[in-house]
């Protein structure tokens, strides 16, 4: 019987709200197995995909993908899918990244917390158009 | 306990033909595994052969070089085949199968001791 | 094509000594490697998954890292029993399941 993939869920650190220039890091999270991440920005044709996964737990892997230096064009939603052979996964909700003048510095109190339950998160379109697998060596146009 | 056996491995002309199992005991094949094979010439390195998923959609997956002449199929909950064709005297090997599983990230961590292969006129 | 590329061919190192072992993709496979130990009339068993996670029941002293392209084993405090050919192994389905050359390890 063919496994039912858990959808991923997406986080923020430090955070959904960023000071301009200070870095923000996607955390993606999808169960064991997965071989690719894929954090898609808005829509399925902007998107950066790694293979640089760790094992969080012993039933959960993750990617992590780091902006270092925020720009007002980064603001927007944020989603992840991922590959688990030989399947991609369903979109996790989305994420909104927001992008606010630089006042407090990377540390400011008003930071808030990203959270794949968080109150930035949007919930995924339903669609289900076919993902290239990984195999296939798709190009991305990058997020950043 | 789990395990994995190959059986079938023979003495063949060139040219021949050649079909391999691989038998799961402790297991089901109906799991979420990659059934792969490798073989291993005499007093040389591992070569990959290709695996199959032994989930409902059975993907295959093959190296370059086995493309047309090596089939991978599930025939039962329990076995795996290796059809081996045009066989020449580099097939000459130990092959073994194994099982990719995703806590261990595709990486095999459960092999049969493998079955010899020898073509030879 | 991947290859992986892994040095030295053969080594030899004292009991109790530290040893390393290369290997080096020509492809970006990201955490995607293993290792495996062979030993005469064996198959190989599984040492090191996703590039340096210990796979269940393997000893401390094995340890894997990567550094891009390029991964690492380090077996420390060398005993008899580790004496034996170290295979790298891609696991990443787009490039696939290549294996390196082996590494043949003698133990003094």
């Known amino acids: 019987q063919e496994e039912d993939l858990p959808r991923p869920s997406i986080s923020a650190e430090p955070g959904t709200v960023i000071p301009l220039g200070s870095h923000v890091t996607f955390v993606c999270r999808g169960p064991v197995g997965v071989q690719t991440f894929r954090l898609e920005r808005d829509s399925r044709s902007t998107y950066n995909d790694t293979e640089d996964v760790s094992q969080a737990s012993p039933s959960e892997s993750e990617a992590r993908f780091r902006i270092d230096s925020v720009r007002e064009g980064n603001a927007g939603l944020y989603r992840c899918i991922y590959y688990k052979p030989p399947k991609w996964s369903e979109q996790s909700d989305y994420l909104e990244l927001l992008v606010k003048e630089s006042s407090g510095g990377p540390d400011s109190p008003d930071t808030e917390p990203g959270s794949s339950a968080g109150p930035t998160q949007r919930p995924s379109d339903n669609s289900h158009n076919e993902h290239a697998p990984a195999s296939q060596g798709l190009k991305a146009e990058h997020l950043y | 306990e789990q395990s994995l056996e190959e059986s079938g491995g023979d003495l063949v002309k060139p040219e021949g033909s050649l079909t391999l199992t691989c038998t799961a005991s402790?297991?089901?094949?109906?799991?979420?595994?990659?059934i792969c094979w490798v073989r291993q010439t005499p007093g040389k390195g591992l070569e990959w052969i290709g695996c199959?998923?032994?989930?409902?959609?059975?993907?295959t997956y093959y190296a370059s070089w086995a493309k047309g002449r090596f089939t991978i199929s599930k025939t039962s909950s329990t076995t795996v085949t290796l059809q081996m064709t045009s066989l020449t005297a580099a097939d000459t090997a130990t092959y073994f199968c194994?099982?990719?599983?995703?806590?261990?990230?595709?990486?095999?961590?459960?092999w049969g001791p493998g079955t010899l292969v020898t073509i030879s006129s | 094509e991947l290859v992986l590329t892994q040095t030295p061919a053969s080594v030899s190192a004292a009991v109790g000594g530290t040893l390393t072992i290369k290997c080096q993709a020509s492809?970006?496979?990201?955490?995607?490697l293993a290792w495996y130990q062979q030993k005469p009339g064996q198959p190989p068993k599984l040492l090191i998954y996703?590039?340096?996670y210990l796979a269940s029941g393997v000893s401390s002293r094995f340890k894997g890292s990567r550094s891009g392209t390029e991964f690492t084993l380090t077996i420390s405090d060398l005993d008899c029993d580790d004496a034996a050919t170290y295979y790298c192994?891609?696991?990443?389905f787009g490039n696939g399941h290549t294996f390196g050359g082996g590494t043949e390890v003698v133990v003094k």
């Open positions: 194994a099982r990719g599983a995703d806590y261990v990230y595709w990486s095999y961590g459960l």
């Open positions: 402790g297991f089901s094949f109906n799991s979420n595994y990659w």
């Open positions: 199959i998923y032994s989930g409902s959609s059975g993907d």
């Open positions: 492809e970006t496979i990201g955490t995607n």
């Open positions: 996703l590039a340096s």
């Open positions: 192994q891609s696991t990443h």
